[in-house]
């Protein structure tokens, strides 16, 4: 049971972690203009990834999309790729834990093959998480330093007499849902894999074999298991399976811990 | 067609207060930006304030901040501007005018007149 | 505050003259975000209120004759009026629509010779 719950929770995180991606990369506000300590202007400037926007205190919005690609700065480049990269990967890796729900049954797919799968999105969703704090991350350094720069020379003044402010640009929103949505879906991939290890079985199952010394009755299990003695040394009700043996409440075995963000 | 009407008191006594009202009719009063500018007998136009569409956001000339008020009621089309504490200083014509793409003031009321005298 | 100032304070033309009118900031009127000057010009006739000519520093309001235009960037621009006709006769300013306090130059007053 609570190997299912922190595979479902992880899930359900990194879907929202993805969602928060998707937002994220289509906001316009990743850079906005600084207004503090600036003359107040009746104009904001904000600029996303793929398009830059301006709006009048008249309430009129006006925005143009970056129509050119070789134009760009490289590092803008950089974040949509990682951006890109992070949605295509959690996407995919969604895609892959759906199947890979113990809840869900597909036709007599075993749970060795849920447990790949399970471990395959949580990968996925861990790069994908990365993708998107790193890419987040560039753009908010790429920020800092055109900041720092723009505040050195603030106002470049013609013959001391006539001004002109320069546009600083600070962290917009985008910026902060990036960062968040990134370690929601790095988290969610974390509960994946942690959910695989539950569903993994532990051990390689074989047959039992008996092997019967003179005076003792001890089965011999191979493939690591313990060797039991036929008396009640395991109380646990066994099913016998063709594979092997197991316990009915082994899936729920393997404590974990949630962190509920 | 775009309409706006001011209406006030006219004459006043300094350091009283008065209001102010612009009527607006014609266009949707809830989407635009107003303003309101003044001009003194003779002179040249004075921005006075402004006020987004929703109300929240106002701005005001230093000459006049801390004394008028500017305040709008989209439910009745209605923008006022409140003068507190008026000098002969403050003897104008008061327009409101509309804020429209540019942050121009594409529309203008035909102006009402306040003068502060004793 | 940004200072707007314009020139000359008052012209006297002839009907058809092209008639110039100059306003300078003291700050960039220009906008980086979207490559736009916040001046705009109007037009105030005795006793009448002002009305709205040019925006962006360039842009034609609607149902404004083409006679007038605009046009600079940065700190310096420039009003136009191509032919001057009689109904022209007013006083005519360019505000700062960038930066707050809004600012209007003093006004240039236009009359017929």
């Known amino acids: 049971m609570a190997v299912t719950a922190c595979q479902g929770l992880g899930f359900v995180v990194s879907l929202i972690g993805i969602a928060g991606i998707i937002a994220a990369t289509c906001m316009d506000q990743w850079s906005t203009q600084d207004l503090y300590n600036n003359p107040v202007t009746a104009v904001f400037n904000y600029q996303g990834l793929w398009r830059s926007c301006v709006r009048e205190s008249s309430g009129f919005t006006e925005c143009r999309g970056y129509f050119t690609l070789l134009g760009l700065p490289a590092m803008l480049q950089a974040v949509r790729a990682l951006m890109i990269v992070g949605i295509v990967l959690g996407a995919i890796g969604l895609l892959v834990s759906i199947f890979a729900l113990k809840c869900i049954r597909i036709g007599s797919m075993e749970d060795s093959a849920k447990a790949n799968m399970t471990l395959t999105s949580g990968i996925m969703f861990i790069v994908s998480g990365l993708c998107a704090i790193a890419g987040v991350s560039v753009f908010a350094n790429m920020l800092v330093t055109n900041f720092w720069m723009s505040t050195a020379n603030m106002y470049t003044g013609m013959g001391g007499m006539v001004q002109t402010v320069q546009t600083r640009y600070t962290f917009g929103a985008a910026l902060f849902v990036g960062w968040v949505a990134g370690g929601l879906t790095l988290i969610g991939g974390v509960m994946m894999c942690i959910a695989c290890r539950g569903l993994a079985p532990e051990e390689t199952n074989y047959k039992a074999v008996s092997y019967h010394a003179s005076g003792h009755s001890v089965a011999y299990k191979p493939g690591g298991f313990k060797a039991s003695t036929g008396f009640g040394s395991n109380t646990k009700n066994k099913k016998i399976y063709d594979g092997g043996a197991r316990t009915e409440d082994e899936v729920q075995s393997y404590p974990s811990k949630h962190d509920y963000v | 067609q775009v309409q706006l009407q001011e209406s006030g008191p006219g004459l006043v006594r300094p350091s009283q207060t008065l209001s102010l009202t612009c009527t607006a009719s014609?266009?949707?009063?809830?989407?635009?930006?107003m303003n309101w500018v003044r001009q003194p007998p003779g002179r040249g136009l004075e921005w006075v304030a402004f006020i987004s569409n929703g109300g929240s956001y106002t701005e005001y000339n230093p000459s006049v901040k801390g004394r008028f008020t500017i305040l709008r009621d989209n439910s009745k089309n209605q923008l006022s501007l409140r003068l507190s504490s008026v000098t002969a200083a403050d003897t104008a014509v008061y327009y409101c005018a509309r804020h429209d793409k540019g942050n121009a003031l594409d529309y203008w009321g035909q102006g009402s007149l306040v003068t502060v005298s004793s | 505050d940004i200072q707007m100032t314009q020139s000359p304070s008052s012209l006297s033309a002839s009907v058809g003259d092209r008639v110039t009118i100059t306003c300078k900031s003291s700050?960039?009127?220009?906008?980086?975000?979207?490559?736009?000057?916040?001046l705009t010009w109007y037009q105030q006739k005795p006793g009448k209120a002002p009305k709205l000519l040019i925006y962006?520093?360039?842009n034609l309001q609607t149902g404004v004759p083409s006679r007038f235009s605009g046009s600079g960037s940065g700190t310096d621009f420039t009003f136009t009026i191509s032919s001057l006709q009689p109904e022209d006769i007013a006083t005519y300013y360019c505000q700062n629509d960038y930066f707050y306090p809004l600012t209007f130059g003093q006004g240039t007053k236009v009359e017929i010779k």
């Open positions: 962006w520093a360039s």
């Open positions: 700050q960039s009127l220009l906008n980086s975000g979207n490559q736009k000057n916040y």
């Open positions: 014609g266009f949707t009063f809830s989407k635009y930006a």
